[in-house]
Every structure is written in structure tokens, then in C-alpha cells.
């Protein structure tokens, strides 16, 4: 397995799991154990396909940069670690890297780090600070929901609105109408009663299930026209949130498991 | 919460062979180097094995060079150490430990070599 | 093959810093951890990477390295740090993780 006459010198690639907001710099750090002394350092990212893609390296004190100057390797003072760090990630950065080192002369062979997983996630809203900055830009999904709701609210107004009009119009139409049982009695949740509305993030389902209240059945005379107003259903009571279980995504990695320790 | 247990130690003639076992738990164990360390009697730390991520480097104290063999398989969390033609100065507690950094260690396992 | 030196012991007064060396040519190129073991337990990580501490680690625990000399110094030495620490390094010329001898501490 080895080459008996070429140096060579385990590697570690931290965190074992990073996870940045888009925008931000990721960075790891590709530490040898021990300085050879001649070897190419290289960055990879690992494909689909489970092939190895270059996306930097270091060779004889100097950093050869990929394609994408986003990738940047650099050597810290003690020569041994190499900061390699993603300039303003981007979502479809996330994935596995790792570094691997080739010694001098020529080895076919590389020796790898262990691998590390990245995950950058969409920018979520922040709240104002006391500093003026440009509103950061909704995301695609974020952007949508806060559109489906503005969209809902408009209708509901339009639809106030109208029967605001029929009533005024007819006035017939709504004196025949009562509610039967009394107000004390809990509205029931049919089976059609609960759209559910999931915004897919990363590996967590966070769903918002909107329980529509049915309203009362009407007890009118069957000329009766009426108009029924149904208003958005609350969000769920706290006894229907997500259990802890279903959020385990959401924890920190445990720091014991990762190829390295970061320092206090 | 990381656990590495050892096992496999025993009591063995000069010339005979043990194999050492260490089951990990806790942690993504195909994502560590792993070294096997031994300490004799009142001694110090002796390292005697390393293999690396994805078990293709291996590496080995002189002292123990072509009679032991380490090897992981990642699928059972297990790393071995296989021990032929063992020799007295081979008694000790053979412990296994992450590598670089070594920051989980097992309890250790006793193999004593005598006739 | 690649030697580590650690004295056999050292001693430190009680709330005192201790220094602990560990010595091998040009060491200053190589990642440093240093161990601690108590009678009859496993060695534990106190230092890696020369200066860096696992967590859990006291802050009275600090690496350094450079040069020909590795140095562990524990500010305030307590009671409870007397054991024998092990420096190690990997030395990629003989592909061999290298422990020194180990120094004895004790706490007067």
C-alpha cells in the first residue's frame, strides 16, 4: 500500500461540519502533522460522482488558485496549517471537501484528509441594527411565502368588501340566517380543514399547518342566500408544534466529532 | 458521547499470535486516523500503529514491523491489530486512540507474552 | 529514527508555573500534543497542534513550539496536575508518531 521511500504526513481538514449563511466566507483548516520537504498541497471538493474536483492548491510557497478566485488557500506562520476558505458562499457550494497532499518527486498516490461537510444556508431576515444597511434580498422561498400571505390578506378584504356590498345591496338576503349552538362550543377541524404549508429548508421541514376554523352550520330557510366569510386559520396551538425529535437537524454537530479540534 | 473499547487481550506463549479489537461509537469513525499505543509495566507510551482515513496508509513502530498488521473496517466501527510471532517485550496495555489529534483514547487491553 | 527528550522529572511549588520541555530537531516543523496520564488511566489530549486546547482543558494548560524545543507550562500548577505528561509528534521521514519519555510532575 505505502511507498516505502516517500515522506509522508497524516493530514486533518476542520470543522468536520461547517455551516455558513450565504454571502459569508467558509473556512477550514488543512493542518499537516509534519512539514516534508517538498509536497503539493491541493483542495478538493468531492463530485456526485464521488470524484475529487480541484479547487486550489499550494505548491513550493506559492498558491496556485483554480478557476474560481472564490477558492483561496492560505499558509499560516507555522507552515504546517492552510486556512482554505470560500469567499461569499454560495448555496450551491454546500457539500464534502477535504485536502490531499502529494509528495515530491511524483507520487501517484495522494493522501487524503478525512472529509468535511459544508452547508450554506439561505441569508434569513435579520432585524435592523443601529447601523444603516441595504435591506438584505428576500430568498426565493421566503419571497414566495411573503407573497402567498399579502395575496390571502387582499382577498380576504376584497371578500369583506363584497359581502359588505351584498348586504348593503340585499338586505334581505341576511335576515333569515342564524347560528345554531352556542358560542362556548369548540369549532370542529374537518378533514379539509388543514392545508399544510411547507417550506422545504436545507434538511428541515419546518411546517406551519393552518387549521381553518369550519364555520357554524347555518340554520337558514333554503331561499335564503347568505354569504359565508371564512377568515385565515390561526397557526396551530403549541401543543401542535414540531417535537423536539423532528428538529434534531437543526442541533450543532457535537464537537467530538470532527477529523479536528478547533482551540478554544 | 465518544467511547473506544478494546478487547481481545490475553495471555499467550512466545511465537503465538492475538488479535486486538477496538469497537468506536460516538463519533463518524471512518472519518479519523487511528492509532494503536501499548505501555509496558511501568514504562512509558509506546506508539505501535497507524492507519489512516479510508485505511489506505498504514504505518508501524520498528519494533513491530512485519509482525503486526492494523486495519479498519469502517462498516463495523472496528479497528484491529493483528499480532503474529509475539515476544515478551510485547507485554503491555495496547490501547487505541484517535489520531491527529489523539483525543479519544479506549481503556486499554492487557497482553501479557510468557511462557 | 526521530528522538523526543523529556526530562524524567520536574517539580513546582504549589500555585506555581511549571515548564515542561520536550526537545527533537527541528520540532518547531512538526504539530506538538502533549498528554497527561494519572496511575492506572488512559492518557488524555491536554494540547495539539502546538498551542491549541481540547475542550474541557483548564486555561492554566499553554503549548509553544519553535525551533529545537517544545514547551508545556501550566500557570498555577494545582494538586490535581500532578501526573506524567508525554510530548508526540508524527515524523514524516521514518512515518512514525514519536512520544518522548515522559516527564514526572510533582506538586510540593
Known amino acids: 500500500l505505502d511507498s516505502p521511500d516517500r515522506p509522508w504526513s497524516p493530514l486533518t481538514f476542520s470543522p468536520a461540519q461547517l455551516t455558513v449563511q450565504e454571502g459569508e466566507n467558509a473556512t477550514f483548516t488543512c493542518s499537516l502533522a509534519d512539514i516534508p520537504d517538498s509536497f503539493v498541497l491541493n483542495w478538493y471538493r468531492l463530485s456526485p460522482r464521488n470524484q475529487t474536483d480541484k479547487l486550489a492548491a499550494f505548491q513550493e510557497d506559492r498558491i496556485e488558485p483554480g478557476r474560481d478566485r472564490r477558492f483561496r488557500v492560505t499558509r499560516l506562520p507555522n507552515g504546517r496549517d492552510f486556512h482554505m476558505s470560500i469567499v461569499a458562499a454560495r448555496l450551491n457550494d454546500s457539500g464534502i471537501y477535504l485536502c490531499g497532499a502529494i509528495y515530491l518527486p511524483p507520487n501517484t498516490q495522494i493522501n487524503e484528509s478525512p472529509r468535511a461537510e459544508l452547508s450554506v444556508t439561505e441569508r434569513t431576515l435579520e432585524p435592523p441594527t443601529q447601523s444603516p444597511s441595504p435591506p438584505p434580498r428576500l430568498s426565493g422561498q421566503l419571497q414566495g411565502l411573503v407573497i402567498g400571505v399579502t395575496s390571502v390578506l387582499v382577498g380576504v378584504l376584497l371578500l369583506l368588501l363584497l359581502t359588505w356590498v351584498l348586504a348593503a345591496v340585499f338586505p334581505r338576503a341576511t335576515r333569515g340566517a342564524c347560528v345554531c349552538g352556542s358560542e362556548d362550543e369548540p369549532l370542529k377541524e374537518g378533514p379539509d380543514a388543514a392545508p399544510v404549508f411547507t417550506l422545504d429548508y436545507g434538511e428541515l421541514d419546518f411546517q406551519w399547518r393552518e387549521k381553518t376554523p369550519e364555520p357554524p352550520a347555518p340554520c337558514a330557510p333554503e331561499q335564503t342566500e347568505y354569504a359565508t366569510i371564512v377568515f385565515p386559520g390561526r397557526p396551530a396551538s403549541p401543543g401542535r408544534r414540531a417535537s423536539a425529535s423532528s428538529l434534531q437537524g437543526a442541533q450543532p454537530p457535537s464537537p467530538e466529532d470532527g477529523p479536528g479540534l478547533w482551540p478554544l | 458521547e465518544v467511547q473506544l473499547v478494546e478487547s481481545g487481550g490475553d495471555l499467550v506463549k512466545p511465537g503465538g499470535s492475538l488479535r486486538l479489537s477496538c469497537l468506536a461509537s460516538g463519533f463518524t469513525f471512518s472519518n479519523f486516523h487511528m492509532n494503536w499505543v501499548r505501555q509496558a509495566p511501568g514504562k512509558g507510551l509506546q506508539w505501535v500503529a497507524f492507519v489512516n482515513v479510508g485505511g489506505i496508509r498504514t504505518a508501524y513502530a520498528d519494533g513491530v514491523k512485519g509482525r503486526f498488521t492494523i486495519s479498519r473496517d469502517d462498516a463495523k466501527n472496528t479497528l484491529y491489530l493483528q499480532m503474529d510471532s509475539l515476544r515478551a517485550d510485547d507485554t503491555a496495555v495496547y490501547y487505541c486512540?484517535?489520531?491527529?489529534?489523539?483525543?479519544?483514547w479506549g481503556q486499554g487491553t492487557l497482553v501479557t507474552v510468557s511462557s | 529514527s526521530y528522538v523526543l527528550s523529556q526530562p524524567p522529572s520536574a517539580t513546582v511549588t504549589l500555585r506555581q508555573t511549571a515548564r515542561l520541555t520536550c526537545g527533537g530537531d527541528s520540532i518547531g516543523r512538526k504539530s506538538v500534543e502533549w498528554y497527561q496520564q494519572k496511575p492506572g488511566q488512559p492518557p488524555v489530549l491536554i494540547i495539539f497542534?502546538?498551542?491549541s486546547r481540547p475542550s474541557g482543558i483548564p486555561e492554566r494548560f499553554s503549548g509553544a513550539n519553535s525551533g529545537n524545543t517544545a514547551t508545556l507550562t501550566i500557570s498555577g500548577a494545582l494538586a490535581e496536575d500532578e501526573a506524567d505528561y508525554y510530548c508526540?509528534?508524527?515524523?514524516?521521514?521514518?512515518?512514525?508518531?514519536?512520544f518522548g519519555e515522559g516527564t514526572q510532575l510533582t506538586v510540593l
Open positions: 486512540a484517535r489520531a491527529f489529534p489523539g483525543d479519544y
Open positions: 497542534g502546538d498551542s
Open positions: 508526540q509528534v508524527w515524523d514524516s521521514n521514518t512515518k512514525a508518531w514519536v
